[in-house]
């Protein structure tokens, strides 16, 4: 005989996580980012939607604009001008591409109360921004840029050539939006607003993706997109200042290319001003292991741009492409010149270097086996900035802060010791002069937002610790979280295990791989997360494991330039390589094992299905690239080289998903793409598909119409809810 | 140029209301936005109220709807009626000028000063 078990009422009432908590959003949390306007001045938009003024030293706040104000116009966002004048407000939001969107701006004079009424800007607008002091206004309509001196002046027209799908003034086409810059605007104001340098992208020879969007008419809508796939011709790039101050006098001037990237296709990285009459460029060569930045000075007497060659600063992997995913970003420091900037050491670390005249004499600021990841703030005496270096963890990120005052220079890690089981991986945002900082954690434990003195680093006060949340999750049994490596042939794999709540490791489970597996990406980072894999582990049983292989970020050279001009090869391996060491582990069921990825996860775990292992069961490709000659050139390019027969186009061939189409005989697939994806063309999927049926190979479909690679809305529910009966059926679990 | 001078603090009971005024000497008063700033002992001097030269006014949080600041431009001055007075309204009530917007909330924004008057009110 057993003794009956104790009867714990606390434990009686947890419950597992359901399905329907996730599509509702249940269990998400809140983050604090100040919209910082002075050194210890920020705002914030109140739950009830009033515009709020916060001033950190007296305590004190001031609401600015009403709710009421919001409303009258279904304003969702606002912006304050540098000279607290005016404020514009943005309603009628219609999303276009990841960060593109169009909206109708009003402008309100805070001095009457009143709307700025007469010369009131057209709609709908592309973009629109202040300029760094006063109340100049620029923004981008029908591909134009216009200046206004002041909201209700007249628009002064800087650009005529602006046509849709043609000619990008201010503005990203898709590619650089998506890809280089990565924002929805493409202007740049000097910091005190005397200039403003804009980028001009000619996409007339771009060939384009038309789609069909099928709406509710009659006849479907065709999306036409200049889109250049991987190979084809390339958006044309330059880069204009104009004076705003006379924009008549001499127009539109334009920056010179340095030669040695003129010489043949390149790209435009990224623009930072230095001072009023000093601005840094970055340029790229098409095939992106070399990029120049150069620092252009303005030349009063002929009113030029100067960029002299003993100003240019070249960068260049020979291992690899430059850069991480994307080529860094040099913060200068106050001398206007030197500059502090990301980029490999000779151990193959990513590191933060100090550049006073030469690349090859910069001083190296950040050192060791792990990785520099951002540079946050420099001021007079201190450097900011995020790595993954506290106790070998690659998947956390702690801000450090580095007196650059002193020499030797001092580091202190601001955040490590903070709240150390709840906050692991941080960013942080600061004011004006680093006076005052917030401090964002997201987890491993429920994020909690706080506001520090940029001084002593003392916490002020906590702006959100999501309070409800944490009470919401008292009575819910999440599943358990594991980080871990494994030390495979002189590769480190990080994997994250997410168990269910009562995981015994005498029992066996169900095994679900969620890949992605992109070059430069992370899937094991100390974060909070309640999705629908935490769904799974809680109420379905299973174990989830996410696994960094060959080509991901954070963990040195070797690791992320592997996959270097061979994607499709070792991102798969180390999938599979990782299930093999979970299945010795014990606990794991190996009739029941599945993966699913979305995007390059989709290609990943299509590739992982079929490689011939035998290993998987069944498994989900969302939204999946099939062959790399479908996608954006300025992506593949930077991993694969170009699709010619005297560059990489072999393996071109030999990575696509359609060439194993024989190899899915023996799992069950699920695909699924949406119809209106501008990103993976559902291209992707449809040869997959043809491959397949080719093949008479059988599997499943789902399709999602008028939908993009996000599959946002109430397909959400329906993509969750479908991919939980396919794993469900496959692992022979009740419904 | 604009010169500023204070009156009508004292000393007043809980619950209990005042009147401070700030006259200004110069012909552009219209043009200046108006503040009144209070610095308690041993506390940073904090925006209590402050009305912008289009009449648009501006409130801290804790005196929304006790306080009201008003301007006469033709008198060249700037009032702030206070009700339902607290002790922990208890300060010296500085009266400051700028051109410009007023809804700037540090005292080093504000370039012309009154030199104060004490208000004290109590329990």
């Known amino acids: 005989l057993r003794p009956s078990r104790v009867h714990n009422s606390e434990e009686n009432t947890m419950r597992a996580l359901t399905l329907k908590d996730i599509l509702n959003g249940t269990f998400s949390y809140k983050t604090f980012f100040p919209n910082w306007i002075s050194g210890q001045e920020y705002l914030h938009q109140s739950a009830d939607n009033n515009i709020v003024l916060y001033n950190i030293e007296t305590g004190q706040s001031y609401t600015i604009l009403s709710n009421r104000t919001m409303k009258s116009v279904n304003a969702s966002n606002y912006g304050l001008s540098p000279d607290r004048q005016f404020v514009y407000l943005e309603s009628d939001y219609s999303k276009l591409w990841r960060y593109s969107y169009t909206a109708t701006y009003y402008i309100y004079d805070l001095s009457n109360g009143e709307f700025v009424r007469g010369n009131e800007l057209p709609r709908p607008i592309q973009y629109l921004c202040w300029s760094p002091v006063g109340s100049k206004l620029a923004y981008v309509y029908q591909n134009n840029i216009y200046l206004k001196q002041r909201p209700g002046d007249p628009p002064f027209q800087i650009t005529f050539n602006g046509r849709e799908n043609k000619i990008f003034n201010g503005i990203p086409d898709w590619v650089y939006e998506e890809e280089m810059l990565p924002t929805k605007y493409a202007l740049w104001w000097s910091p005190n607003g005397k200039f403003l340098a804009y980028a001009e992208f000619n996409d007339k020879d771009i060939p384009v993706i038309a789609y069909s969007y099928y709406g509710d008419e009659q006849y479907p809508r065709t999306i036409n997109i200049p889109y250049p796939k991987a190979g084809a011709k390339n958006p044309v790039v330059r880069i204009f200042i104009i004076d705003t101050t006379y924009p008549a006098y001499v127009g539109p001037q334009e920056v010179p290319v340095p030669a040695m990237i003129a010489s043949s296709d390149y790209y435009f990285s990224w623009l930072t001003w230095v001072t009023d009459e000093r601005v840094c460029l970055q340029w790229l060569k098409r095939v992106q292991n070399v990029s120049v930045l150069s620092i252009c000075d303005f030349r009063e007497d002929w009113q030029t741009w100067d960029c002299p060659k003993t100003q240019e600063h070249i960068e260049e992997s020979r291992t690899g492409w430059a850069g991480g995913f994307f080529v860094s970003r040099p913060v200068f420091s106050y001398d206007a010149i030197s500059y502090y900037k990301i980029f490999s050491d000779k151990d193959g670390y990513k590191h933060i270097h100090y550049i006073k005249d030469t690349v090859e004499n910069a001083i190296q600021i950040t050192s060791g086996k792990w990785e520099a990841i951002n540079i946050f703030r420099v001021t007079q005496d201190s450097l900011f900035y995020s790595s993954n270096e506290f106790e070998e963890y690659p998947g956390r990120r702690n801000i450090y802060r580095i007196s650059i005052g002193s020499y030797p220079p001092s580091k202190k890690c601001v955040t490590c010791h903070l709240r150390k089981e709840r906050c692991q991986y941080y960013t942080a945002s600061f004011s004006d002069y680093a006076k005052y900082y917030a401090l964002v954690c997201y987890g491993p434990g429920i994020p909690i937002s706080t506001l520090h003195d940029g001084r002593t680093d003392q916490e002020i006060k906590i702006l959100e610790e999501n309070k409800e949340l944490e009470n919401a999750l008292k009575n819910i049994q999440l599943p358990k979280e594991e980080i871990k490596k494994l030390e495979v042939d002189e590769i480190t794999l990080w994997y994250k295990m997410i168990l269910p709540p009562q995981f015994d490791r005498s029992k066996k489970y169900p095994l679900l791989i969620q890949v992605y597996g992109g070059p430069c990406s992370q899937s094991v980072r100390s974060v909070f997360a309640v999705n629908w894999i935490s769904y799974l582990a809680s109420k379905e049983g299973m174990v989830i494991a996410l696994v960094d292989g060959r080509g991901t970020a954070f963990q040195g050279d070797k690791l992320l330039y592997a996959v270097y001009r061979k994607l499709g090869v070792y991102e798969v391996e180390d999938q599979i390589t990782a299930v093999r060491k979970f299945i010795e582990m014990g606990f794991i069921d190996e009739k029941r094992i599945a993966i699913w990825g979305w995007s390059y996860g989709g290609y990943v775990s299509s590739l992982a299905l079929a490689s011939g292992t035998g290993l998987f069961k069944c498994g989900i490709a969302v939204a999946p690239v099939s062959s790399w000659e479908y996608y954006a050139s300025v992506y593949t390019e930077r991993f694969m080289g170009l699709p010619t027969k005297d560059d990489n186009l072999e393996h071109y061939k030999n990575s696509t998903v359609m060439a194993r189409a024989e190899y899915f005989r023996n799992v069950d697939y699920l695909l699924i793409h949406g119809t209106a994806d501008d990103n993976v063309h559902f291209q992707n999927s449809a040869q997959i598909a043809k491959a397949l049926v080719n093949a008479q190979v059988d599997f499943q479909a789902m399709w999602y119409s008028d939908q993009n690679h996000g599959l946002s809305g109430l397909s959400t529910n329906h993509l969750y809810t479908h991919m939980t009966h396919f794993l469900k059926q496959c692992f022979s679990l009740s419904d | 140029q604009v010169q500023l001078q204070e009156s009508g603090g004292g000393l007043v009971e809980a619950e209990g209301s005042l009147r401070l005024s700030c006259a200004a000497s110069g012909r552009t008063f219209g043009s200046y936005a108006m503040g009144w700033f209070r610095q308690a002992a041993g506390k940073e001097r904090e925006l209590v109220a402050a009305?912008?030269?289009?009449?648009?006014?501006l409130y801290a949080d804790n005196v929304k709807g006790r306080f009201t600041i008003s301007r006469d431009n033709a008198r060249n001055t700037v009032y702030l009626l206070s009700n339902s007075l607290k002790p922990e309204d208890t300060a010296v009530y500085y009266c400051?000028?700028?051109?410009?917007?007023?809804?700037?909330?540090?005292?080093?924004?504000?370039?012309?000063w009154g030199q104060g008057t004490q208000v004290t009110v109590s329990s």
């Open positions: 400051a000028a700028r051109r410009g917007s007023a809804y700037y909330t540090n005292h080093i924004d504000w370039p012309y």
């Open positions: 009305i912008s030269a289009g009449g648009s006014t």
